[in-house]
């Protein structure tokens, strides 16, 4: 297949909503649930998520929303929250209105004329906001996710079916298969389609093999596959690695835990903008890499690479994208160098000589079967070819 | 306790219009989501259509939809239901219901019933 073409790379940050909601038909999700298919009904406004109301919920509703959100059915409805015929007291005659306070406050209602997700509107305001919530486990309790790639966008992909979590094979395994994992889990795009081994392998069931998406699914589900076979084992364990999943490297520097910051974030290496670079961001950074903590951030050089990040942590996080972060945004780095930085674990700390190495290419080979390029005595990096 | 009293039924031919009222003794009127049900012979009772507090939010059967409006006029303590397009199939008794704690849209929010008046479709 070709490759799903990357949409426009806009300006982004870790406080937009999603590129894309699991509800897209239906502008509903769940939420503290146990999987993406079980949980807290909530509404999309416009802009925010709220909770649908309890009162008006319904075995149609209940329905709707498991089938829009590719989870079967739902589950008895004994399992949804009860409606209580017992509402609040209406008030004491002669009261003082309180309708625009009770408008305010309302709870948005998802109504149901039948149990199909194009039956179902969403309309504000239509209870008082006294607390119960709509709940709804639905029937095939399906979820997906990425595990073991250092964040919810890259790793391998696993599926929640009938209760356990299990591997997908690789058989088959492409672009468009990851490009649907991707799109699904609102990680953007596929960069990679990874064959087996590349993360560690699952335990348990292996549920799908011969997936064969078109790209346009909506969920992995949807697409053509068969049932995991025996042959299948979990060294043929699929992966993917989405576009909005970062990591990191330093470069230009004696090793690894010294250099220029850069990230592998949309497809490509970018700069990190130094405006805000701050020692809680090179902390985290230096920790993350295994690096120790960070000693100094000398002063960068002009930004050279195609995109720019930026971060502001408050030195507690795990990695960078755990931190608020921005990407291509011209203002905040229109007046920066690129961030650098040396973290404690660097040789260059522990006046050990580095061996020259010329400049011009050589060509290691090792084990025979594995051959490495050392492009450039200053980043040192190592590619496979 | 607030009492609902409907007017307007009536008989009506096939295509013909109508306007049903519901007045309401309370004066905290504003404080209910109001709606309208039916019941035609023989048949078990239906949503019809349904109003917020202020009448910034309203929800229609689908069976209606495009031919039936709801209003409310907080001032006057009244609620209208104006039906267009009328068909024999919307012959039924027409209830006024009123609800504190949401949208009476299903039957087990709903806090009071009017009595009902009746509205037939017939040439």
């Known amino acids: 297949h070709p490759s799903p073409a990357p949409p426009d790379q806009l300006n982004t940050s870790s406080a937009e909503s999603e590129l894309w909601e699991p509800g897209e038909r239906l502008p509903v999700r769940l939420t503290n649930g146990s999987s993406s298919c079980s949980g807290t009904v909530e509404v999309r406004l416009e802009a925010s998520w709220e909770p649908a109301c309890g009162a008006l919920w319904d075995s149609r509703a209940a329905e709707a929303v498991c089938r829009a959100l590719g989870c079967g059915g739902a589950e008895a409805a004994s399992q949804l929250a009860p409606p209580t015929p017992e509402l609040p007291p209406p008030p004491a005659a002669g009261n003082t209105s309180v309708a625009a306070n009770a408008t305010l406050a309302g709870a948005p209602a998802l109504l149901c004329s039948g149990a199909e997700w194009r039956l179902c509107e969403v309309v504000e305001h239509a209870c008082r906001s006294d607390g119960r919530r709509a709940r709804v486990t639905c029937a095939e309790n399906r979820a997906l996710r990425l595990v073991d790639g250092g964040g919810a966008c890259a790793g391998r992909v696993e599926m929640l079916e009938h209760g356990e979590w299990g591997s997908v094979c690789d058989d088959t395994w492409d672009l468009e298969d990851a490009h649907v994992v991707c799109r699904q889990l609102g990680c953007g795009w596929a960069v990679q389609a990874l064959p087996g081994l590349h993360f560690t392998p699952g335990r348990g069931p292996i549920h799908r093999d011969q997936v064969n998406c078109s790209g346009a699914e909506a969920y992995l589900w949807d697409c053509p596959g068969l049932p995991g076979q025996h042959y299948c084992g979990h060294k043929e364990d699929a992966g993917a690695v989405c576009s909005e999943h970062q990591s990191w490297r330093l470069t230009g520097g004696a090793d690894r835990c010294e250099g220029q910051v850069e990230v592998h974030f949309r497809g490509v290496w970018n700069t990190v903008c130094d405006s805000e670079w701050y020692p809680s961001e090179a902390k985290v950074l230096c920790q993350s890499l295994g690096c120790g903590t960070a000693v100094e951030r000398p002063k960068g050089l002009p930004h050279s690479l195609s995109g720019r990040m930026y971060y502001s942590c408050n030195g507690e996080e795990l990695t960078l994208s755990n931190c608020s972060w921005r990407f291509n945004n011209s203002n905040l780095c229109s007046q920066s160098l690129a961030a650098r930085v040396l973290c404690s674990a660097s040789r260059s700390l522990h006046n050990l000589s580095t061996p020259e190495v010329p400049a011009s290419v050589q060509t290691v080979t090792i084990e025979s079967s594995v051959t490495v390029k050392i492009e450039n005595k200053e980043s040192r990096e190592l590619m496979l070819l | 306790q607030v009492q609902l009293v409907e007017s307007g039924g009536g008989l009506v031919q096939p295509g013909g219009s109508l306007r049903l009222s519901c007045s309401a003794s309370?004066?905290?009127?504003?404080?209910?989501?109001l709606g309208w049900f039916r019941q035609a012979p023989g048949k078990e009772r239906e949503f019809v259509a349904a109003i917020n507090w202020v009448g910034g939010s309203t929800y229609y059967a689908d069976s209606v939809k495009g031919r039936f409006t709801i209003s409310r006029d907080n001032s006057k303590n009244t609620l209208y239901l104006q039906m267009n397009s009328l068909k024999p199939e919307d012959t039924a008794v027409y209830y006024c219901?009123?609800?504190?704690?949401?949208?009476?849209?299903?039957?087990?929010?709903?806090?009071?019933w009017g009595k009902g008046t009746l509205v037939t479709v017939s040439s």
């Open positions: 219901v009123a609800s504190w704690g949401a949208m009476p849209v299903l039957t087990h929010v709903i806090n009071y």
């Open positions: 309370e004066r905290t009127f504003s404080d209910y989501a």
